[in-house]
């Protein structure tokens, strides 16, 4: 049977907690990538962001997660309306932004 | 020491709102990851689930009774307060308050309860 | 909801017993299980949260294991203290739900 909404969302976070718990050298090799606009569709932003980082094991995984997620085929080079203009981040921080709103979204009972 | 101590009217007829304070102890509800739940337990049976509030004002109720209950806090005075509207002999029970704390997975363990505070239903 | 199912409601041992209560959830609830205590005219007090991490002050003769849908509480030798009704609760996600409670008695 299909895993509940709810589910995914919780071991979508638990792989975020992972890797900024278990972090010792920079992740991804310090690389950068599109910050985005959280307040909307976030998984295929996040997504779109995160798939132009390659060779990068960590978050591998979270990239899987993400694609499950979003209901369209996300390839490298995309972008959509959701990235900030013009603004890159570490993929450290880009993780530990992506948490918080995640977080916030499963507090609030908010799985779609 | 984390305390929670919880305070109603004892007794309340069919119909009203009831009205029950969780007054904390110890720590703070303004402090980032905290929450704060509601249960309750009928004389000899088992125990409900409430309602939930985060520090950051984010609520969660049991849908069974979510058109009844309104949970809400004042940082100010370190409370939580529920409401339960329309009660009910049913809705006898004792009232429990309870501390979740959610550092890194969400959890929802509560750590740390109040005594309770026994409500009567009956006119 | 996820609905807990615990057994035994009830059961009689003696003290230097090793006890096992069972909770089965309606769905997998990835190891966010829970386990209280709850003596007669008391709150009840966390024992064990996620599956298995003991909450602080609980002695060690009280663990948890478990995966998935099914979960375990063991008191590896019961003492007159453990006189309570024990509770499973689900911690994935509101509503968060109890088991109907297991009554342990000593012979």
């Known amino acids: 049977s299909p895993v509940p909404r709810s589910t995914a969302l919780k071991e979508l976070i638990e792989e975020l907690v992972n890797i900024t718990q278990n972090q010792k050298a920079p992740l991804c090799n310090g690389s950068m990538v599109w910050s985005i606009n959280l307040t909307a569709g976030v998984y295929c932003a996040a997504l779109e962001s995160l798939i132009n980082v390659s060779g990068c094991s960590a978050i591998e995984k979270t990239q899987r997660m993400l694609n499950g997620f979003c209901p369209h085929k996300v390839s490298a080079g995309q972008f959509s309306s959701l990235r900030v203009r013009d603004t890159k981040i570490e993929v450290a921080q880009f993780v530990k932004d992506l948490l918080v709103h995640l977080k916030k979204l499963f507090r609030e009972g908010r799985f779609n | 020491e984390v305390t929670l101590r919880e305070s109603g009217p004892g007794l309340v007829k069919p119909t009203q709102t009831l009205t029950l304070t969780c007054t904390l102890y110890?720590?703070?509800?303004?402090?980032?990851?905290?929450?704060v739940d509601w249960i309750r337990q009928p004389p000899g049976k088992g125990l409900e689930w409430l309602a939930h509030i985060w520090w950051d004002d984010v609520k969660r109720y049991n849908p069974a009774l979510k058109s009844r209950l309104t949970i809400s806090k004042d940082t100010s005075k370190n409370q939580v307060v529920l409401k339960l509207t329309s009660v009910d002999p049913v809705d006898t029970a004792t009232y429990y308050c309870a501390r979740t704390v959610s550092s890194g997975y969400i959890y929802y363990a509560m750590d740390y309860w109040g005594q309770g505070t026994l409500v009567t239903v009956s006119s | 909801d996820i609905q807990m199912t615990q057994s035994p409601s009830s059961l009689s041992a003696s003290v230097g017993d090793r006890v096992t209560i069972s909770c089965r959830a309606s769905q997998d609830i990835r190891n966010y299980l829970n386990w209280y205590q709850q003596k007669p005219g008391k709150a009840p007090k966390l024992l064990i949260f996620?599956?298995?991490k003991l909450h602080s002050g609980v002695p060690s003769r009280f663990s948890g294991s478990g995966s998935g849908t099914d979960y375990t509480l063991t008191i590896s030798s019961l003492q007159p203290e453990d006189i309570a009704t024990y509770y499973c609760?689900?911690?994935?996600?509101?509503?968060?739900?109890f088991g109907g409670g297991t009554k342990v008695e000593i012979k």
């Open positions: 110890g720590f703070s509800l303004s402090t980032s990851d905290m929450g």
């Open positions: 609760q689900q911690g994935l996600t509101p509503p968060l739900t």
């Open positions: 996620y599956t298995s």
